[in-house]
């Protein structure tokens, strides 16, 4: 049965931010997992895509992601299907809108002492709370004949008088964030002496070193005064300009012109109109310097013919918002057809091989233009250049099996031996072109081989047999150095195998014939009685018709095997006295003697002052201590053989002499006295 280890759960999400609907499945066999949105399968895009079994959102969209999501796991073999619990997003968002006149129906109907209602068209979820501003100053409920209905987003002025004239704006904030009105409303209630806005400055975005113009006009009777201020409250006039506004000009009609705009000129400009009576009207506009960031790199994409694919171009951050378009081969893509642009996406429907190539996403605004290329490869199913062939390979030599294919992109080749994937190791190597090399062919390599060549578009495979031809070889190879015991019978075997049974013969390396007491019997060299003259170099030659001959060289040494002339005896020594363990061996070549004590070889160069090994092989230990007790092994060895003999050493406390004992009394046990 299919079991959900993790189910998707409904959750809060923020518009344009990341989100993840988790889904994890456990099943006895392979299952494939997909997602439904309101019952319809979810297609992967760069914004919303499967990540493992889970569904990942790069940027939540309140319109496209509203509805019920469900994770579905299906076993394509059994047809069993399991569906997770439903999950949906509570998407939090806020969106700016204009301030509009709700009552009366038109601006022309606004008269002093009438009721005026303005509405703030900022919307969001959860419902935001609203704040109203007149000429940039916050309005609090109940002050100066106005009421704010947050529920209806309305500002009511009852009655409206000249003192209410001004630029009305609103801002709203919620758990998601904050937004301010995209277009403000200028309320003008005539009091001839009050300054009234005729033309309000607008926010301006300009490219560096371009010019910016702010228009500002007030009317009143008598005419009002007009003054421009930059951020730090520094007045701007044609006679006194701040150092960083040297290129500012104020025209008679109130317009402010800035030429060769630099970053330091960016900021808030205030236009202040003052009538004979009434409050000053302060209008604000911001000068933004246009900017455009770099675009992120595209990963190369590999698509299969006949499919539909989309590539999303995420526009770079910029001011103003950059416009985006796609080009291919220098031509802008249309908004419909088989290969077209939809929003920021490049859409390729029913992909053809000819669609492969470089596509360019362009983004541009006042600050300039950015572009980023994406390389699209249309994958093709591999085709054969050379299939693997049934082959006879020689044992011990390298063997090659071809698997040459062509496709776009370059195909991946894997090899199987006895239906098991070959992993590259010291014996098997797969070349870039797909050829398999068996570094040193063994008889076990005689079996089935199969190669598979794949691209995302599909795969092809072919198999071939390998038959291994046995090489001519010694089984086993004779030891290159061997010893024979002087005056004894000895045999030196030599055997070989090949595709045909080889004949085997021995000869002396110098080419001389074997003496009559030495026989060569089917590859075994037999010495009836070894003499000193039998030492030397011999060659075993194995040969057959089809494979020629092979040779093995053996150096025979004649030796007198080791015997012990003197062996160490079981020895007991008083603590603090000296122990002598004697050992003498004879043989030819003359044996060397080594001692082993307490399970380690006693290195003559590292014995310390208490121990010494004599030329004749005897071991002496001075000032013995209880820890010197144990088994000591005398090892005699030469180039032909090795023998050992051992004896225990006991270290005992010296007894305290009793009154009755005379000076000549013998010790209670046999020991060395020093």
């Amino acid at each position: 049965a299919i079991v959900f280890i993790k189910q998707p759960s409904s959750q809060d999400a923020l518009q344009g931010r990341r989100a993840l609907l988790r889904c994890e499945v456990e099943a006895p066999g392979p299952v494939h997992v997909y997602w439904l949105l309101d019952g319809a399968p979810v297609q992967d895009t760069e914004r919303r895509f499967a990540q493992g079994s889970s569904l990942s959102f790069a940027a939540v969209d309140r319109l496209q992601d509203s509805g019920t999501f469900q994770c579905v796991a299906r076993d394509d073999v059994t047809g069993e299907e399991a569906r997770s619990a439903n999950a949906s997003f509570n998407i939090k968002w806020i969106e700016a809108g204009p301030v509009v006149l709700k009552h009366p129906a038109s601006e022309a109907e606004i008269q002093p002492q009438t009721q005026v209602t303005l509405r703030c068209h900022i919307d969001g979820h959860p419902r935001p709370t609203y704040q109203w501003f007149r000429d940039g100053t916050p309005l609090s409920d109940g002050q100066s004949n106005h009421t704010v209905s947050s529920k209806e987003r309305n500002l009511t002025l009852r009655p409206a008088g000249p003192e209410h004239s001004g630029l009305y704006s609103c801002c709203a904030h919620s758990a998601f964030g904050q937004a301010c009105s995209s277009q403000n409303f200028t309320l003008s209630i005539a009091d001839e002496s009050f300054a009234r806005v005729v033309l309000a400055p607008q926010d301006v975005v300009v490219a560096r070193y371009e010019e910016a113009m702010f228009h500002c006009q007030f009317s009143a009777q008598p005419p009002p005064s007009l003054q421009w201020l930059f951020e730090d409250e520094t007045p701007i006039t044609n006679r006194s300009r701040p150092p960083h506004l040297r290129r500012a000009t104020v025209f008679a009609n109130g317009s402010l012109l800035l030429t060769q705009v630099r970053p330091r000129n960016a900021g808030i400009y205030r236009c202040i109109g003052q009538g004979q009576r009434g409050p000053p009207i302060i209008l604000e506009a911001t000068l933004h310097l246009a900017e455009i960031e770099d675009m992120p790199l595209f990963e190369p994409r590999v698509f299969t013919a006949g499919s539909e694919e989309r590539v999303t171009c995420l526009p770079p951050k910029g001011l103003p918002e950059p416009s985006v378009w796609w080009e291919h081969a220098g031509v802008r893509l249309p908004t419909h057809g088989r290969v077209y642009q939809k929003g920021h996406e490049l859409v390729l429907a029913n992909i053809a091989e000819s669609d492969a190539g470089v596509y360019t996403c362009h983004a541009a605004n006042l600050a300039g233009q950015r572009r980023q290329d994406v390389n699209i490869t249309v994958a093709t199913v591999p085709s054969w250049l050379k299939k693997p062939q049934d082959s006879q390979l020689e044992e011990g030599k390298p063997g090659y099996l071809d698997c040459l294919t062509q496709a776009t992109p370059k195909p991946t080749v894997v090899w199987y031996r006895n239906q098991m994937l070959i992993s590259e190791d010291s014996r098997f190597e797969v070349f870039k072109n797909g050829t398999l090399r068996i570094n040193s062919v063994e008889v076990y390599d005689g079996t089935w081989y199969r190669c598979m060549s794949s691209t995302p578009a599909g795969s092809i495979e072919a198999q071939a047999r390998v038959q291994v031809l046995e090489k001519l070889k010694f089984t086993p190879p004779p030891q290159p150095q061997q010893c024979m015991e002087f005056d004894k019978e000895a045999t030196v075997p030599c055997s070989a195998t090949g595709r045909e049974k080889p004949t085997i013969k021995w000869e002396r390396a110098d080419g001389s014939s074997l003496p009559e007491w030495v026989t060569d019997n089917a590859g075994t060299l037999h010495f009836a009685r070894v003499t000193r003259d039998d030492a030397g170099n011999y060659t075993c030659i194995a040969s057959n018709g089809p494979q020629g001959q092979i040779r093995a060289h053996v150096q025979l040494t004649v030796a007198v095997f080791i015997t012990f002339k003197v062996e160490p005896e079981r020895t007991t020594v008083y603590q603090g006295h000296t122990a002598l363990l004697q050992c003498e061996a004879q043989g030819d070549p003359k044996p060397l003697i080594q001692w082993k004590g307490k399970d380690r070889i006693l290195d003559p160069t590292k014995l310390g002052p208490r121990m010494h090994i004599f030329q004749n092989g005897s071991l002496v230990i001075h000032d013995v201590a209880p820890e010197d007790s144990g088994r000591y092994t005398c090892i005699a060895g030469n180039s032909c053989n090795i023998k050992h003999t051992e004896a225990p050493l006991y270290v005992v406390d010296k007894p305290v002499p009793e009154e009755s004992e005379g000076p000549g009394s013998p010790p209670p046990y046999k020991m060395i006295q020093t």
Epitope: Q392, N418, M420, V443, G446, T447, R465, Q467, R499
Partner: antibody, heavy 117, light 107 residues
Framework: QVQLQESGPGLVKPSGTLSLTCAVS?????????WSWVRQPPGKGLEWIGE???????NYNPSLKSRVTISVDKSKNQFSLKLSSVAAADTAVYYC??????????WGQGTLVTVSS | DIQMTQSPSSLSASVGDRVTITCRAS??????LNWYQQKPEKAPKLLIY???SLQRGVPSRFRGSGSGTDFTLTVSSLQPEDFATYYC?????????FGQGTKLEIK
């Protein structure tokens, strides 16, 4: 040196299932050998039944494929033959054999299975 | 299935004789041919593999040759222990098939 030893009942009833096991010694069943079954009806020639590799891949004689199952037990170092719906014509000496390089270099001594009621 | 036909079906010879057994495949099998020797009440024993390669431990008087569809097994000088039934087998395609056998008897 690989040695093979067949075991199983010598008498099977018609329409029953013949079950034989081949114990492998002197080598591992996970080596590069293919492990085969061959049979020889009394006084007749040799007939190849099928083969298995330690990974579980099998090849069967199409004439017997619908009735044959060969399996491998790595933990016991043995492989088995099951032949269902047997008839008198399935009476034979059954050999297990193995090899590599496209030959059968190692054989068991064979076991006679008689199909009779 | 590939049919393997051996000839002769039986043959009488004396110790020291040279004998030849032939095996023909119904379609080409390259060199995927093996020869086996079977004595009464015994399991078959591999003599030759890959048409001409001598199995380890087999005397050199046994020799195999041929490729494609026609193959021969030659025993150069018969020994008493060589009297037995000989089978050829193809391992080129499944099912692997044996010849019907050649019985070599003492004259």
């Amino acid at each position: 040196q690989v040695q093979l030893q067949e075991s199983g009942p010598g008498l099977v009833k018609p329409s029953g299932t013949l079950s034989l096991t081949c114990a492998v010694s002197g080598g591992s069943i996970s080596s590069d050998h293919w492990w085969s079954w061959v049979r020889q009806p009394p006084g007749k020639g040799l007939e190849w039944i099928g083969e298995i590799f330690h990974s579980g891949n099998t090849n069967y004689n199409p004439s017997l494929k619908s009735r044959v199952t060969i399996s491998v037990d790595k933990s016991k170092n043995q492989f088995s033959l099951k032949l269902s719906s047997v008839a008198a014509a399935d009476t034979a000496v059954y050999y297990c054999a193995s090899g590599y390089n496209w030959n059968l270099g190692y054989w068991g001594q064979g076991t006679l299975v008689t199909v009779s009621s | 299935d590939i049919q393997m036909t051996q000839s002769p079906s039986s043959l009488s010879a004396s110790v020291g004789d040279r004998v030849t057994i032939t095996c023909r495949a119904s379609q080409t099998i390259s060199s995927y041919l093996n020869w086996y020797q079977q004595k009464p009440e015994k399991a078959p024993k591999l003599l030759i593999y890959a048409a001409s390669s001598l199995q380890r431990g087999v005397p050199s008087r046994f020799r195999g040759s041929g490729s494609g569809t026609d193959f021969t097994l030659t025993v150069s000088s018969l020994q008493p222990e060589d009297f037995a039934t000989y089978y050829c087998q193809q391992s080129y395609s499944i099912p692997y098939t044996f010849g019907q056998g050649t019985k070599l008897e003492i004259k």
